[in-house]
Interface confidence: low
Amino acid sequence: DSSKWVFEHPETLYAWEGACVWIPCTYRALDGDLESFILFHNPEYNKNTSKFDGTRLYESTKDGKVPSEQKRVQFLGDKNKNCTLSIHPVHLNDSGQLGLRMESKTEKWMERIHLNVSERPFPPHIQLPPEIQESQEVTLTCLLNFSCYGYPIQLQWLLEGVPMRQAAVTSTSLTIKSVFTRSELKFSPQWSHHGKIVTCQLQDADGKFLSNDTVQLNVKHTPKLEIKVTPSDAIVREGDSVTMTCEVSSSNPEYTTVSWLKDGTSLKKQNTFTLNLREVTKDQSGKYCCQVSNDVGPGRSEEVFLQVQYAPEPSTVQILHSPAVEGSQVEFLCMSLANPLPTNYTWYHNGKEMQGRTEEKVHIPKILPWHAGTYSCVAENILGTGQRGPGAELDVQYPPKKVTTV
């Protein structure tokens, strides 16, 4: 509309008692330069006098007279486009409507700006993303609808009352569109931050507390689990019973399913927090863990290595090498599955015990023909003695002996 003066400034400005207010403002007059400027507080138009009544905070005419008591109010504008104002300090009773009465040679205009001054520093506002998940970086934003050149402030982040180590980026805006101070903090919350209190604290230049806002973190995370086993060392004998218990130390949201895994494979029909293994066999040795899921995903406990101890199984003998040439060396190895490992071995040659041979390996450095035959062994551990297996045959090759001609 070409019949109007054009102004741009924030609609409402916020401050508190004793602070200041900086009002960014631009204008375009209908004709020529500004000749007179009066800043009113709560102006009202008087039809009788065809003038505005109200407290005059600032007055600037062609004569350049400024009321001496209003030094706290400054007009920082010019005669054709800038109408920026500063009030320092600002008082509670400055709240209300500011009226900018502008006059050029032929035209007049009253522009209104709202000023909201609170008794005490008002709190900033923390903005969080709609959902926070563990280990995913989020930006926490603290916004304060205040900024003024004459009143420096700072925003500080606290976690459970302790300053946060992460570097925050503070920005200010003092434009015709908006006036604010904003602090942004990039943060990768862990599950343990769930339920913790984050505070954005408004401080003055000296670090003195002015106000704050707090939020409670709602960190979505997979279930966090603890596994307990009886007996605690997870070492049992064949035939014993084992109980494993899965405890959920934290889950957000609630957990929905429970399962048990052995060596990475899910155990069928085991969907409770307790795993009872009765009369265990050696095949049940392995790594066990529990897995509990919620809407975020599955959580796994640490692994428990279950060792089922048993007496040695029937042993087998491995010969390196058969057939053997007379004079060569041969090694015999007694192999028997056992837990714990066998500590003692008994060796047999053609059914007769070989005295002094108690090791897993028997080494014969120089084979003679009489060494040929069947070798077997018996393994022994703390749980008992195994059975003698079928044994292995040593064949000794040698050149003709005692040649006789017929």
Epitope: N218, N252, E254
Partner: nanobody
Framework: QVQLVESGGGLVQAGGSLRLACAAS????????MGWFRQAPGKEREFVGA????????DHADSVKGRFTISRDDAQNTVFLHMNDLKPEDTAVYYC??????????????????WGQGTQVTVSS
């Protein structure tokens, strides 16, 4: 904001039963977990039991397991604490509370955002 009002307290003989009720109003949609706590004279406020938002999970303090149970009436926005086989040591002011931040904090009184004013339960021997 959530408002909580407890009722149902009173004087009962040892071995008797009571049913406490906690009626929630206000922003009840955002309630996640409801807990019952109690405070005996000169003692700290202690966890009694909790109920999850879905109603799927309940938890009780060891001292009341097998005697106290928690249930809810969604239509009435009410949670109940059923107390059987009451003992003189159960004498306390019973409070209901709500928190929004996860089952992990069900026993931690500091995590509860809103509290009722409490109802007195006295068990005489």
């Amino acid at each position: 904001q959530v408002q909580l009002v407890e009722s149902g307290g009173g004087l009962v003989q040892a071995g008797g039963s009571l049913r406490l009720a906690c009626a929630a109003s206000g922003d009840t949609v955002s309630i996640y977990y409801m807990g019952w706590f109690r405070q005996a004279p000169g003692k700290e406020r202690e966890f009694v039991g909790a109920l999850s938002a879905s109603g799927q999970f309940t938890d009780h303090a060891d001292s009341v397991k097998g005697r106290f149970t928690i249930s809810r009436d969604d239509a009435q926005n009410t949670v109940f604490l059923h107390m059987n086989d009451l003992k003189p040591e159960d004498t306390a002011v019973y409070y209901c509370a709500v928190q929004r931040y996860g089952w992990v904090y069900r026993t931690d009184k500091t995590m509860y955002n809103y509290w009722g004013q409490g109802t007195q339960v006295t068990v005489s021997s």
